[in-house]
């Protein structure tokens, strides 16, 4: 089982939307896949996928989950608020037929205030 997560860094304006993608690949077929998104180490949601469907469509405040076969799990935050800023990690585990787990690398989300004057110093702190 392997998990690739992206992007590494995401900077968005407050009130817009942010999309985090997790690609989950497994050499053999799986019957049930447990997935988990965390923010700063705290669990946002922990649904499972079976028969091609997610057991849960929401993930944390203003978060929506989707599964696109064969391998893409997407977390969409809309609208984004300042407290969405943080470090997000996607984790996956094949529960059936046999346990195997993996996690992605961190996606760092920075949310800029809607008022650009509040943001002048922060942009200088996070170039690019």
């Amino acid at each position: 089982l392997s998990v690739q997560q992206g992007p590494n860094l995401l900077q968005v304006r407050q009130g817009s939307q942010a999309t985090l993608v997790c690609q989950v690949d497994q050499a053999t077929a799986w019957e049930r896949l447990r997935v988990k998104w965390t923010k700063d180490g705290a669990i946002l949601c922990q649904p499972y996928i079976t028969n091609g469907s997610l057991s849960l469509g929401v993930c944390g405040p203003q978060g929506r989950l989707s599964w696109q076969a064969p391998s893409h799990l997407t977390l969409q935050l809309d609208p984004v608020s300042l407290n969405h800023s943080g470090a997000y990690v996607c984790w996956a585990a094949v529960e059936i037929p046999e346990l195997e787990e993996a996690e992605g690398n961190i996606t760092r989300l920075f949310v800029d205030p809607d008022d650009p004057t509040q943001n002048r110093n922060r942009i200088a702190s996070f170039p690019g």
């Epitope: 089982l1 497994q26 050499a27 077929a29 996928i49 076969a69």
Partner: antibody
């Protein structure tokens, strides 16, 4: 690019242990998402997957070989190895190492194979 | 274990003609979770290791000529060579990776008529 090379004795006596090593070049066997397999081809051309060791050191074996087979690795040498105990003439075959990935689950790179004969 | 049954055992086809090889699995190789069929096709030429032609039942590996066509779903799969070339002779194998143990078909020997 990745290359695999099998090595080991070409003749093994019945009831002894067959030991082969696959040396991987151009790619680390610890790379996440990759599996390192042993496959054998019998004289009649039939192919049999024997088992794999994955990037984390986890293994999976063909139940048809019962508890006779062990696959291990040496990451410092970028090698993985096969041990098959209690061999008989029925284990005479060409033994190949091969790799596949989670993302593209097919055997995309194979060694050229080494012929092993079990005979006294 | 999933049993892979190939037919025919051998096949002789004239150059430029169509060759068809079948593979039947003892259980479905389709997953609704991934919308994939876990089936591969290989060609083994004399003195060489098998080389992948088709994966996920119908996806040609980059560099494989488009005369090689994989089709089918579930338990019934077909490899078609639309116009046989001299370099296509060899042994063809189907292989599943739905679960472990991974298993291969017994092969189909393709020759020029």
């Amino acid at each position: 690019q990745v290359q695999l090379q099998e090595s080991g004795p070409g003749l093994v006596k019945p009831a002894q242990t067959l030991s082969l090593t696959c040396t991987v070049s151009g790619f680390s066997i610890s790379t996440s998402g990759y599996y390192w397999s042993w496959i054998r081809q019998f004289p009649g051309k039939r192919l049999e997957w024997m088992g794999y060791i994955n990037y984390g050191g986890g293994t999976s074996y063909n139940p048809s070989l019962k508890s006779r087979v062990t696959i291990s690795r040496d990451t410092s040498k970028n090698q993985f190895s096969l041990k098959l105990t209690s061999v008989t003439a029925a284990d005479t075959a060409t033994y190949c190492c091969a790799t596949m990935a989670d993302r593209f689950a097919f055997f995309d790179v194979w060694g050229q194979g080494t012929m092993v004969t079990v005979s006294s | 274990d999933i049993v892979m049954t190939q037919s025919p055992d051998s096949l002789a086809v004239s150059l430029g003609e169509r060759a068809t090889i079948n593979c039947l699995s003892s259980q479905s190789l389709f997953s609704s979770n991934t919308n994939r069929n876990y089936l591969n096709w290989y060609l083994q030429k004399p003195g060489q290791s098998p080389k992948l032609l088709i994966y996920h039942a119908s996806t040609r590996l980059s560099g494989v000529p488009d005369r090689f066509i994989g089709s089918g779903s579930g338990t019934d799969f077909t490899l078609t060579i639309s116009s046989l070339q001299a370099e296509d002779v060899g042994d063809y194998y189907c292989q599943h990776h739905y679960e472990t143990p991974l298993t291969f078909g017994d092969g189909t020997k393709l020759e020029i008529k």
